[in-house]
Amino acid sequence: AASCRETCCPVGPSGLRCTRAGTLNTLRGLRGAGNLTELYVENQRDLQRLEFEDLQGLGELRSLTIVKSGLRFVAPDAFHFTPRLSHLNLSSNALESLSWKTVQGLSLQDLTLSGNPLHCSCALLWLQRWEQEDLCGVYTQKLQGSGSGDQFLPLGHNNSCGVPSVKIQMPNDSVEVGDDVFLQCQVEGQALQQADWILTELEGTATMKKSGDLPSLGLTLVNVTSDLNKKNVTCWAENDVGRAEVSVQVSVSFPASVHLGKAVEQHHWCIPFSVDGQPAPSLRWFFNGSVLNETSFIFTQFLESALTNETMRHGCLRLNQPTHVNNGNYTLLAANPYGQAAASIMAAFMDNPFEFNPEDPIPVSFSPVDTNSTSRDPVEKKDETP
């Protein structure tokens, strides 16, 4: 390495050191940088900007040091191509600010910014919070005011410093299938930069029309379907301090529906059902035409659904060790303000031991009553599934 006279010299198998004074004005297109994990830059007064594409191709970079150089500006998306970056040292440069967006999405273990003329502004509130909360090793110096000797309160006490406030106004009335729904996103805050809707969950649930601009964005959902239920409609906004977003769900009313499946024997017995409807329907079971009162031996158990974005609920009428007295017709009635539905199924769990054909031979036993009984051991699973 001592004999290297290039602008940048390799260090170990995946490091690069650029310390020859005044030889670099950009990091774009560093040679052999493909699997670089460490880049050290020093004494480069002409290196003044770090832009979006400057670190393209450095996907493996873990540590970046640019010190004692002329860096004045780091683009908010400068580290887009280095998602694995965990150590960032930009000390002793000419940075007056650094956007929160620059480090967003990175898992930084330490960030060093000492020796920069950082100006006390709302744009650096995120940095002060990191320091206060020890979110990673942050090394800076006291933030400077614009005038000499000015005593600045910590930024957190400056009430005008804050992320935007975002609120979504929704219709108060209930929404039904086929309706048009207008949502309004109201944004308040200092130095608002941009705002928009996130509508990725809404594909196929309605036609969407955006309108308006900061500080009030409109969204019309045309001809909504019941699939819109449980889907997030999100509005976000950004300023110097950070990003805020808020989500709402539009509730689209529709009538109850119900489906019953054939009884299946698991550890216990289960009569599977699916119910849908908005609002969520109330359920009532009937056995042979009479109301079935649920107990710890016969009760409704909903299945935990991995899908939280749908209104349909699945479950079981669970029967613990049912006997012949439980054989019969089971009906599930589901009802909500928009309608009701019912489904029935016959279930036979066990033959009646007291029913016999008079022509069958009657068994006669001369041996004493057998007290031995096969003992069945249900195994309780580790996760305590009932």
């Epitope: 009760f299 613990n320 060790q321 305590e384 009932p386």
Partner: antibody
Framework: QVQLQQPGVELVKPGASVKLSCKTS????????MHWVKQRPGQGLEWIGE????????NYNEKFKNKATLTVDKSSSTAYMQLTSLTSEDSAIYYC??????????WGQGTTLTVSS | QAVVTQESALTTSPGETVTLTCRSS?????????ANWVQEKPDHLFTGLIG???NRAPGVPARFSGSLIGDKAALTITGAQTEDEAIYFC?????????FGGGTRLTVL
Amino acid sequence: QVQLQQPGVELVKPGASVKLSCKTSGYTFTSYWMHWVKQRPGQGLEWIGEIYSSNGLTNYNEKFKNKATLTVDKSSSTAYMQLTSLTSEDSAIYYCARHWYVFLDHWGQGTTLTVSS
Amino acid sequence: QAVVTQESALTTSPGETVTLTCRSSTGAVTTSNHANWVQEKPDHLFTGLIGGINNRAPGVPARFSGSLIGDKAALTITGAQTEDEAIYFCALWYSNHWVFGGGTRLTVL
């Protein structure tokens, strides 16, 4: 492991009310029914009622319908039994017991309730 | 309300087999009664042993078994041990409520 924790002792005055607790751990609280049982010296065990922790559905022994109210707090995985208008007849040990499949399998250690002026 | 009757006390010796029974005032005990057997040891330590007549609860030793003998539910301890000395309660389910027996005090001498 499955645990049902009950306070050891409650001392209350006649005519008052008391809320007994049964804090659970080691299993998914909302998947099971919880039962409450009364034990008086020389009088064996009496079943008070049951509650489904998932939705608060209850069934009571007729004898205790106007005496006991069963509730659950899912956030703390705790079952409760409130007893009202207490008299000396309510002095007893009260147990919570978990229902799994066809078993009253796990029991609390009981709360000794003394009703005395 | 139904009454459930058990032997008030039984004595056995270590290694012996002993059977405790549980009778219902409403007639024969059936599978619909989901007969449970619960053990009480000193300091009010209750443990569920048997449920649904003959299902052993997880972790219960195999020497405990449940059955129907005639019109009664039964708990059999095959090869009793000194630590089995306890009070054993039978509980029967009647459609929507449990009724407990008075308990059998088992002494293992």
